[in-house]
């Protein structure tokens, strides 16, 4: 039991896409605030989002130091006025998330079809590797720095004139199809990591076809 | 843990038409690509086709893409394969199978389909 | 599309024989190469996947080298349980396509 007026946080939630990591909560605070925790299994609590009338709190900074480890947060609820008042076992009102693993859980973004471009029979379909958050030596990693091998593109494409479709798989950032000459083609890629368990799939790229800005011919 | 359990398989008379269901139990089916495959007594494997169960895509060997439609039910987790203008040589054991993109790490028991008249 | 040729169509062999069986694609797979067990009246096992990694609960007499367009599977030491037929596999695009099967006889 905590305080008078004062609810614990319920429905923790990890919201991750490319390792950009909001934890989320309800309820909307009437008369009080939060301050959020987080920690690694092994570490110490650090806070974030001090006293805070939100119900999310943004801990991309924190989950990046280390992708692989799997972290853990707490959410406290203080009264609005009262900040240094406890609950009846003289602690703040707090509840635990669920654990997250960044590097097993955070969904694959929608990827981005780079450029094509055709050359004779074979058309080249790269597709754009995403900056990440989670850094190292002080520069952003991409999404292939980090997931590596883990990570492979599908490429469904078409010709224009058909619903057929054919598929390709790549564990780099391209793809080098047969294409028939003469005719246009569209293309969407999804990225997926084959390890997963969970959220192992993005949502498909915008389709985009030959014939437009994107492409180039050469013969 | 992970299942597949084809139904549907039987006689069919040539011209004719199967349905065949592929009922997923102990994962999402959303989460993979699901394929078909069939085997003719005595001989090898043959791919049919493949559904991305959440994005709606599907891929099909060139020689099924007139006669062969793959679809799935997210809510009923189930894959299913339709094949149109069925011939004797369709006669064969139809699997379903769990594909991770890297390799298919499950396979359905099978289920015998028998064109004739 | 892809055709994938496997050889031997069949071989005999005796318990703790080392095993070879070959793969050759008409091009490039880039290691997208799986190889299956497949036993009499049973659905296909994965053996091996991307052409060199063994999967889980596999014993580790199987193995699979190769790149580009030639492949192997080799079993160190066949056990009773291994006489089946094997296939490759490239799912690298598709439409997927297998080898011819090789079926691995008591001799």
């Known amino acids: 039991s905590g305080t008078t007026n004062t609810v614990a946080a319920y429905n923790l939630t990890w919201k991750s896409t490319n390792f950009k990591t909001i934890l989320e909560w309800e309820p909307k605070p009437v008369n009080q605030v939060y301050t959020v925790q987080i920690s690694t299994k092994s570490g110490d609590w650090k806070s974030k989002c001090f006293y805070t009338t939100d119900t999310e709190c943004d801990l991309t900074d924190e989950i990046v130091k280390d992708v692989k480890q799997t972290y853990l947060a707490r959410v406290f609820s203080y009264p609005a006025g009262n900040v240094e008042s406890t609950g009846s076992a003289g602690e703040p009102l707090y509840e635990n998330s669920p654990e997250f693993t960044p590097y097993l859980e955070t969904n694959l973004g929608q990827p981005t079809i780079q450029s094509f471009e055709q050359v004779g029979t074979k058309v080249n379909v790269t597709v754009e590797d995403e900056r990440t958050l989670v850094r190292r030596n002080n520069t952003f990693l991409s999404l292939r720095d980090v997931f590596g091998k883990d990570l492979i593109y599908t490429l469904y494409y078409w010709k224009s004139s058909s619903s057929g479709k054919k598929t390709a798989k790549t564990n780099t950032n391209e793809f080098l199809i047969d294409v028939d000459k003469g005719e246009n083609y569209c293309f969407s890629v999804q990225a997926v990591i084959p390890s997963r368990t969970v959220n192992r799939k993005s949502t498909d790229s915008p389709v985009e076809c030959m014939g437009q800005e994107k492409g180039e011919f050469r013969e | 843990e992970v299942q597949l359990v084809e139904s549907g398989g039987g006689l069919v008379q040539p011209g004719g038409s199967l349905r065949l269901s592929c009922a997923a139990s102990?994962?999402?089916?959303?989460?993979?690509?699901m394929h078909w495959w069939r085997q003719a007594p005595g001989k090898g494997l043959e791919w049919v086709g493949l559904?991305?169960?959440?994005?709606?895509?599907?891929i099909y060997d060139p020689k099924f893409q007139d006669r062969a439609t793959i679809s799935a039910d997210n809510s009923k987790n189930t894959a299913y394969l339709q094949m149109n203008s069925l011939r004797a040589e369709d006669t064969a054991v139809y699997y379903c199978?769990?594909?991770?993109?890297?390799?298919?790490?499950?396979f359905g028991q099978g289920t015998l389909v028998t064109v004739s008249s | 599309d892809i055709q994938m040729t496997q050889s031997p169509s069949s071989l005999s062999a005796s318990v703790g024989d080392r095993v070879t069986i070959t793969c050759r694609a008409s091009r490039d797979i880039k290691s997208y190469l799986n190889w299956y067990q497949q036993k009499p009246g049973k659905a296909p096992k994965v053996l091996i996947y991307?052409?060199?990694s063994l999967a889980e609960g596999v014993p580790s007499r199987f193995s699979g080298s190769g790149s580009g367009t030639d492949y192997t599977l080799t079993i160190s030491s066949l056990q009773p349980e291994d006489f089946a037929t094997y296939y490759c596999l490239q799912h690298g695009e598709s439409p997927w396509t297998l080898g011819q099967g090789t079926k691995v006889e008591i001799k």
């Open positions: 199978a769990r594909d991770t993109a890297a390799y298919f790490d499950y």
């Open positions: 559904i991305d169960p959440e994005q709606g895509n599907t």
């Open positions: 991307y052409a060199t």
């Open positions: 102990g994962f999402n089916i959303k989460e993979y690509y």
